[in-house]
Interface confidence: medium
């Protein structure tokens, strides 16, 4: 594969490109003659013949795992020797799409997928995942329970920054006003947990009443922010004097 | 491996610039290659000069453009003349050289230097 050996460019005897162009861009075999696709994340690359291919701006090819065989073709690069491209950056970066990419190498490939498609072409906009503002994943749910219970709601947020969560009782006053008392406050019958998870940048927060009193009855507000702005869900505890007073939905239980 | 391209600039059409790109790295270069990407089009192949010294140009640039490189500096150049509008582009140098064990050739990719040609 040495380009001392590389004779006069004849364009006529190069095989064709894909007739929809190269995904990643093109570039030129090893005497600069053909033109060839660049070969993209986990495509091979290297090795001899047919087989050998150049890696797309930003990657290079290192010797695959997966064949140990044809030691003797090592040293030039030879039929037995395969590679495989990866990318040099091998850390997540923020896309100016607002999507973060696990490498630069998959941002450029959708940036080349939709200046292919006539849309606008994706640039990095910084290092590491895209910052954005906190979402629920999974709200609280309305309770219903009886006086003495031990009940408990949950709420699990998502956010980059990972948001911070708390847990808000909100009173409606007269004329629509509302204000709301930050928990647990100086009630001895309240727990508030918070962890991380389950996913990364993930918070799942928990408020456990027990046990359950009529002054319990209301709406909780889960409650998260970061950097990036806030987000908030709540759900109502119902405090009721007998079980046979909780409404149980179709194909459901009450929550106990 | 690094790679810094130098000389591009605002030149009016029918004039001349010459850019260079100087490899930085312990490798062995097989082939220099310099592409270019006009505004809002894909890359596209310009020249190429082996170490052997085969040299292959792009039809559009043939007659026009001058493809050379200084082995010892690890440098090439590009000499362009009677520059048109059409040759508005980043500029941008690739070198197919293999600094690994297994002898892979790997590419690797300049920033590019602007040029612009206007009329």
């Known amino acids: 594969s040495s380009s001392d050996t590389c004779g006069p460019c004849e364009p006529a005897s190069c095989p064709p490109l894909p007739p929809l162009g190269c995904l990643l861009g093109e570039t030129r075999d090893a005497c600069g003659c053909c033109p060839m696709c660049a070969r993209g994340e986990g495509e091979p690359c290297g090795g001899g013949g047919a087989g050998r291919g150049y890696c797309a701006p930003g990657m290079e090819c290192v010797k695959s795992r997966k064949r140990r065989k044809g030691k003797a073709g090592a040293a030039a690069g030879g039929p037995g020797v395969s590679g495989v491209c990866v990318c040099k950056s091998r850390y997540p970066v923020c896309g100016s799409d607002g999507t973060t990419y696990p490498s630069g190498c998959q941002l450029r490939a959708a940036s080349q997928r939709a200046e292919s498609r006539g849309e606008k072409a994706i640039t990095q906009v910084s290092k590491g995942t895209c910052e954005q503002g906190p979402s629920i994943v999974t709200p609280p749910k309305d309770i219903w329970n009886v006086t003495g219970a031990q009940v408990y709601l949950s709420c699990e947020v998502i956010g980059i920054p990972t948001p911070v969560l708390i847990w808000n009782k909100v009173k409606r006053g007269h004329y629509g006003v509302q204000r709301t008392e930050l928990l647990p406050g100086d009630r001895d019958n309240l727990a508030i947990q918070t962890r991380g998870g389950p996913e990364k940048h993930e918070v799942t927060g928990w408020v456990l009443v027990s046990p359950l009193s009529k002054e319990d009855a209301g709406e909780y507000e889960c409650h998260a922010s970061n950097s990036q702005g806030q987000a908030s869900a709540s759900a109502k505890i119902t405090v009721v004097d007998a079980l046979h007073e909780i409404p149980v939905k179709k194909g459901e239980g009450a929550e106990l | 491996v690094q790679l810094q391209e130098s000389g591009g600039g605002l030149v009016q059409a029918g004039g001349s610039l010459r850019l260079s790109c100087a490899a930085s790295?312990?490798?062995?270069?097989?082939?220099y290659l310099w592409y270019r990407q006009p505004p809002g089009k894909q890359r596209e192949f310009v020249a190429a000069?082996?170490?052997?010294?085969?040299?292959n140009y792009a039809d559009s640039v043939k007659g026009r453009f001058t493809i050379s490189r200084d082995n010892a500096k690890k440098t090439v150049y590009l000499q362009m003349n009677s520059l048109k509008p059409e040759d508005t582009a980043v500029y941008v140098c690739n070198i197919k050289a293999h600094p690994n064990p297994w002898g892979f050739d790997n590419d690797y990719w300049g920033q590019g230097t602007q040029v612009t040609v206007s009329s």
């Open positions: 790295g312990t490798f062995s270069i097989n082939t």
């Open positions: 000069i082996t170490s052997g010294g085969s040299i």
